[in-house]
Interface confidence: low
């Protein structure tokens, strides 16, 4: 379920692109990163392909978007709020937060200078 | 300053098995993001991409040529390899390897070796 | 596979005028654009990314724009060195695909 952004402007295009993208391998990067490879993660076999396959697979999904810092982060707050809720406890949340601010060096291209992550209501 | 450099025969008989090793000069092989390449031009024509290596393993091929080439990397020794099988004439070229950059809004080939001249012939 | 068209297929122009080259992708390649020079006996040599950018060390009279469909390279004064062929590439998906060359001589 996608969020609801009450952003103005030419923000539209940027989640037109989020949409458009397939943020499912950044996910699953970060959860493999937070909770080990060897570790069973409810929503997928993440078992099945190793963390570093999955990070170039989140960067060449995040390769398709626009080369703003608005979009990539955009992009990250998306996939908080696609992963709040399966995140158990505060520590997860935040290991979560951390992973997810270092995904654009990871991917070798611009970090976001200023991206809000608390894009939950308070649920993350 | 990265440096690339391939090595193999310079002369192939026909029917027979292209193998070439394109040597890396530091740690890179192994880095996120970049795609490691082989790049042929016949003599007085134009740039084919071949197929490209990411360090895991994941390949990706130029469909008219997938059913002969082989590509594969020993990161430990910062080599990537190419075999292409079954040539002809056709397949004589100067040979490049190359390093692709995947970077986000960055997708290039920014650094060749100096190429290396394959000459199928009987 | 998408297909990259380069016109004109040869450019005489004298050194000190501006050269124009056209790469014409189909289907769009968004920005997804490369450029590169290559001498006689040389490997080629990156030159712009993302359809504009300039990479490392190239002269600012290289220039190029584009999106999409349509892309120009333009040199703005041809330097005696500037005379080679030239490529566009692209990568918006795999695989990746060279144009045919452009190349520029002396008049």
């Known amino acids: 379920m996608r969020r609801e952004r009450g952003r103005q402007g030419d923000s539209s295009s940027c989640e037109r692109q989020v949409d458009r993208v397939n943020l499912k391998p950044c996910e699953q990067h970060i959860m493999q990163r937070i909770m080990g490879e060897q570790e069973q993660y409810d929503s997928y076999d993440i078992r099945s392909t190793r963390s570093s396959d999955q990070q170039q697979r989140c960067c060449d999904e995040l390769n398709e978007m626009e080369n703003t810092q608005r979009c990539m982060c955009e992009a990250l707050q998306q996939i908080m709020e696609n992963q709040c809720d399966r995140l158990q406890d505060r520590q997860m949340v935040q290991q979560f937060k951390r992973e997810l601010m270092n995904l654009p060096q990871q991917c070798n291209f611009r970090a976001p200078q200023r991206c809000d992550l608390d894009v939950s209501g308070g649920r993350c | 300053q990265l440096q690339l450099q391939e090595s193999g025969p310079g002369l192939v008989k026909p029917s027979e098995t292209l193998s070439l090793t394109c040597s890396v000069s530091?740690?890179?092989?192994?880095?996120?993001?970049?795609?490691w390449t082989w790049i042929r031009q016949p003599p007085g024509k134009g740039l084919e991409w071949i197929a490209s290596?990411?360090?895991?393993?994941?390949?990706y091929y130029n469909p008219s040529l997938k059913s002969r080439v082989t590509l594969s990397v020993d990161t430990p020794k910062r080599q990537f390899f190419l075999r292409l099988s079954s040539v002809t004439a056709a397949d004589t070229a100067v040979y490049y390897c190359?390093?692709?950059?995947?970077?986000?809004?960055?997708?290039?080939?920014?650094?060749w070796g100096q190429g290396a001249m394959v000459t199928v012939s009987s | 596979e998408i297909v990259l068209t380069q016109s004109p297929a040869t450019l005489s122009l004298s050194p000190g005028e501006r050269a124009t080259l056209s790469c014409r992708a189909s289907?769009?390649?968004?920005?997804?654009l490369a450029w590169y020079q290559q001498k006689p006996g040389q490997a080629p040599r990156l030159l712009i990314y993302?359809?504009?950018q300039r990479a490392t060390d190239i002269p600012a009279r290289f220039s190029a724009s584009g999106s999409g469909t349509d892309f120009t390279l333009t040199i703005d004064s041809l330097e005696p060195e500037d005379f080679a062929i030239y490529y566009c590439?692209?990568?918006?998906?795999?695989?990746?695909?060279f144009g045919g060359g452009t190349r520029v001589e002396i008049k």
């Open positions: 590439q692209h990568r918006s998906n795999w695989p990746v695909t």
């Open positions: 530091d740690d890179s092989i192994s880095t996120p993001s970049y795609f």
């Open positions: 290596i990411y360090y895991t393993g994941t390949t």
């Open positions: 993302d359809a504009s």
């Open positions: 289907p769009s390649v968004g920005r997804f």
């Open positions: 190359a390093r692709y950059l995947d970077y986000v809004w960055l997708r290039a080939f920014d650094v």
